[in-house]
């Protein structure tokens, strides 16, 4: 079935929401004053070999648990990331975007990445798909 303008608009809004969430995480941690950044960078993330279509979000979904674990280090009294809620929200968006009908086996690149590289990769992915929809 061809995508309707309303379904395209919904996809675009969901991607924009995902993009904002990922950017918020990146801005929250990738701050030279973040006392835990050095240690957060010791965690490794798997990167997709290819990420050009919505089905490739399967690769992001599979790394959400490790992402939550690292974000647990980023909380502070005045900075309420609430990792569990944030990751839960991202998970809901990812599931809706990639669809649950098709089963896609994610292929990962050989090299692992830091949390900053990982977030930047998925931010770029979201921006790229949004640009094709607009």
């Amino acid at each position: 079935m061809a995508p309707t303008s309303s379904s395209t608009k919904k996809t675009q809004l969901q991607l924009e929401h995902l993009l904002l969430d990922l950017q918020m995480i990146l801005n929250g941690i990738n701050n030279y004053k973040n006392p835990k950044l050095t240690r957060m960078l010791t965690f490794k993330f798997y990167m997709p070999k290819k990420a050009t279509e919505l089905k490739h979000l399967q690769c992001l979904e599979e790394e959400l648990k490790p992402l939550e674990e690292v974000l647990n280090l980023a909380q502070s009294k005045n900075f309420h990331l609430r990792p569990r809620d944030l990751i839960s929200n991202i998970n809901v968006i990812v599931l809706e975007l990639k669809g649950s009908e098709t089963t896609f086996m994610c292929e990962y690149a050989d090299e692992t990445a830091t949390i900053v590289e990982f977030l930047n990769r998925w931010i770029t992915f979201s921006q790229s798909i949004i640009s094709t929809l607009t």
Epitope: N34, P35, R39, T42, N72, S76
Partner: antibody
Framework: EVQLVQSGAEVKKPGESLKISCKGS????????IEWVRQMPGKGLEWMGV????????NYNEKFKGQVTISADKSISTAYLQWSSLKASDTAMYYC??????????????WGQGTTVTVSS | AIRLTQSPSSFSASTGDRVTITCKAS??????????MNWYQQKPGKAPKLLIY???NLESGVPSRFSGSGSGTDFTLTISSLQSEDFATYYC?????????FGGGTKVEIK
């Protein structure tokens, strides 16, 4: 009981290599970062570097970069600190410690008993 | 690197005394409302032991006579009533910036 047990005292000659160990037990070793701290005779404490046993990712104090190598083998819950060529100035007590950083904390809650390294010709 | 200056470097006290040790950082160790300052106790030939974390939080199992306070660059460790087992060296440590640094230590001796 959560503990870190370090290898025994070492006496070495300048130029020799050395690898000391720190074995964790009583907790999920891969889930906590391990740090190394040096204490020279009669002196204070100096942070050397950190390893994530789960990923193998490391970070070093600039002062110790290229001087030591930190590694880990998560299958045997052990972290290592090694030198390829010891100097007399490496004579010190070396401690491993477990880093806790959840929430708004960042501290060492469990320490190894220390390994004394003596380098003398 | 952040320099931590402890004072005094050593002093003599008697059991029952109220003891105050100060730690001054060369720059603020605060980040988003939290003070990344910890205190450790070390006895001769032993590993350091955590007493206080994030400036004022008492580590589990540490007696309540130990307390910590301060923010920014000025911090204090207080022992309300010194006990015989408290004679040791105390170190402050900042975990706000790499490299983590420790103060030079304060040795508490028996008078």
């Amino acid at each position: 009981e959560v503990q870190l047990v370090q290898s025994g005292a070492e006496v070495k000659k300048p130029g020799e290599s050395l690898k000391i160990s720190c074995k964790g037990s009583g907790y999920a070793f891969s889930n906590y970062l391990i740090e190394w701290v040096r204490q020279m005779p009669g002196k204070g404490l100096e942070w050397m570097g950190v390893i994530n046993p789960g990923s193998g990712g490391t970070n070093y104090n600039e002062k110790f970069k290229g001087q030591v190598t930190i590694s880990a083998d998560k299958s045997i819950s052990t972290a290592y600190l090694q030198w390829s060529s010891l100097k007399a100035s490496d004579t010190a007590m070396y401690y491993c410690a477990r880093w806790r950083g959840e929430g708004y904390y960042a501290y060492y809650d469990v320490w190894g008993q220390g390994t004394t390294v003596t380098v003398s010709s | 690197a952040i320099r931590l200056t402890q004072s005094p470097s050593s002093f003599s006290a008697s059991t029952g005394d109220r003891v105050t040790i100060t730690c001054k950082a060369s720059q603020s160790v605060d980040y988003q409302g939290d003070s990344y300052m910890n205190w450790y106790q070390q006895k001769p030939g032993k590993a350091p032991k955590l007493l206080i974390y994030t400036a004022s939080n008492l580590e589990s199992g540490v007696p309540s006579r130990f307390s910590g306070s301060g923010s920014g660059t000025d911090f204090t460790l207080t022992i309300s009533s010194l006990q015989s087992e408290d004679f040791a060296t105390y170190y402050c440590q900042q975990s706000n910036e790499d490299p983590y640094t420790f103060g030079g230590g304060t040795k508490v001796e028996i008078k």
